[in-house]
Interface confidence: medium
């Protein structure tokens, strides 16, 4: 198991690709001075500076890793889902466009 050590109770996060059965037990950094600031729910950057980031896909914010990613529409890929796949969907490539 992983230890639980939370300086400030973080918002309920989702783990690997948004969710898993195990919640990661994490240590959230920040001392007294940052406490009030960290208790406020962090803005989802997908609703702000990354609002138009994903061209052919949906912006997702993986809060527990503080990472923005794009969930691409079928046949699109790339960091911003801006590239169109020329391949037909084989067993191997199909998961790239989930």
């Amino acid at each position: 198991s992983v230890r639980v050590e939370q300086v400030v109770k973080p918002p309920q996060n989702k783990t690997e690709s948004e969710n898993t059965s195990d919640k990661p037990k994490r240590k959230k950094k920040g001392g007294k001075n940052g406490k009030n600031r960290r208790n406020r729910k962090k803005k989802n950057p997908c609703n702000a500076e990354f609002q138009n980031f994903c061209i052919h896909g949906e912006c997702k914010y993986i809060e527990h890793l503080e990472a923005v990613t794009c969930k691409c529409q079928q046949e699109y890929f790339g960091e911003r889902c801006g590239e169109k796949s020329m391949k037909t969907h084989s067993m191997i490539d199909s998961s790239l466009s989930k």
Epitope: T20, G57, K60, I62, L65, E66, K71, C81, L96, S97
Partner: antibody, heavy 124, light 112 residues
């Protein structure tokens, strides 16, 4: 070229401390969660810690609980591992690894870039 | 913790022959979105590990198509269709569905 270079390993006595560093280059360091993975002599791989892109969240297995601290300095493109109360069983090659790539619809595709490793030996 | 069990631990293969490595997890690696975070890494002698296959069956950039991954739930397989000399090394399966992330013990592939 995407590269991770570890440093800071060495010989330390049980109970001692060591700070490992990992210098990243060739990619936008601040966009990637980072991890440390270790490999004891003639043994397999063991995950040691992970830190989120901004350094807010850190994760550890029980084997290093309360003893190791992962941190990062995005301005310096650097990852760190502070190791305290070291034990003989912490002897290993420590690898810095990037978690990614963060695209194609789901962010976690495994650790796609690894450093060459730095050796930590804990012995009296 | 999720225990990853690989077999065989040693795999002597003749050049050009196929090879297969099994990896079994102590619990399902499918998350609530239906994704399975099972990866395979290759570690050549004296080198750092390299990502080979991610999410069960996806070859990472530059990985030859003789490598393939399959499986679901708790049972997974890495196959090499025709073993080449450069494939010698240790192969690890790893899961990142559940924290802590865990690795298999490794399978050492060697040429007969």
């Amino acid at each position: 070229e995407v590269q991770l270079v570890e440093s800071g390993g060495g010989l330390v006595k049980p109970g001692g401390s060591l700070r490992l560093s990992c210098a990243a280059s060739g990619f936008t360091f601040s966009s990637y969660p980072m991890s440390w993975v270790r490999q004891a002599p003639e043994k397999g791989l063991e995950w040691v810690s992970t830190i989120s892109t901004g350094g807010t969240y850190t994760y550890y297995p029980d084997s290093v609980k309360g003893r190791f601290t992962i941190s990062r300095d995005n301005a310096k493109n650097s990852l760190y591992l502070q190791m305290n109360s070291l034990r003989a069983e912490d002897t290993a090659v420590y690898y810095c690894a990037r978690q990614g790539p963060i695209y194609y619809g789901n962010y976690y595709y495994g650790m796609d870039v690894w450093g060459q490793g730095t050796t930590v030996t804990v012995s009296s | 913790d999720v225990v990853m069990t690989q077999s065989p631990l040693s795999l002597p293969v003749t050049l050009g022959d196929p090879a297969s490595i099994s990896c079994r997890s102590s619990q399902s690696l499918v998350n609530q979105e239906g994704e399975t975070y099972l990866h395979w890494y290759q570690q050549r002698p004296g080198q750092s590990p390299k990502l080979l296959i991610y999410k069960v069956s996806n070859r990472f950039d530059g990985v030859p198509d003789r490598f393939s991954g399959s499986g679901s739930g708790t049972d997974f397989t890495l196959k090499i269709s025709r073993v080449e000399a450069e494939d010698v090394g240790v192969y690890y399966c790893s899961q990142s569905t559940h924290v802590p992330y865990t690795f298999g013990q490794g399978t050492k592939l060697e040429i007969k």
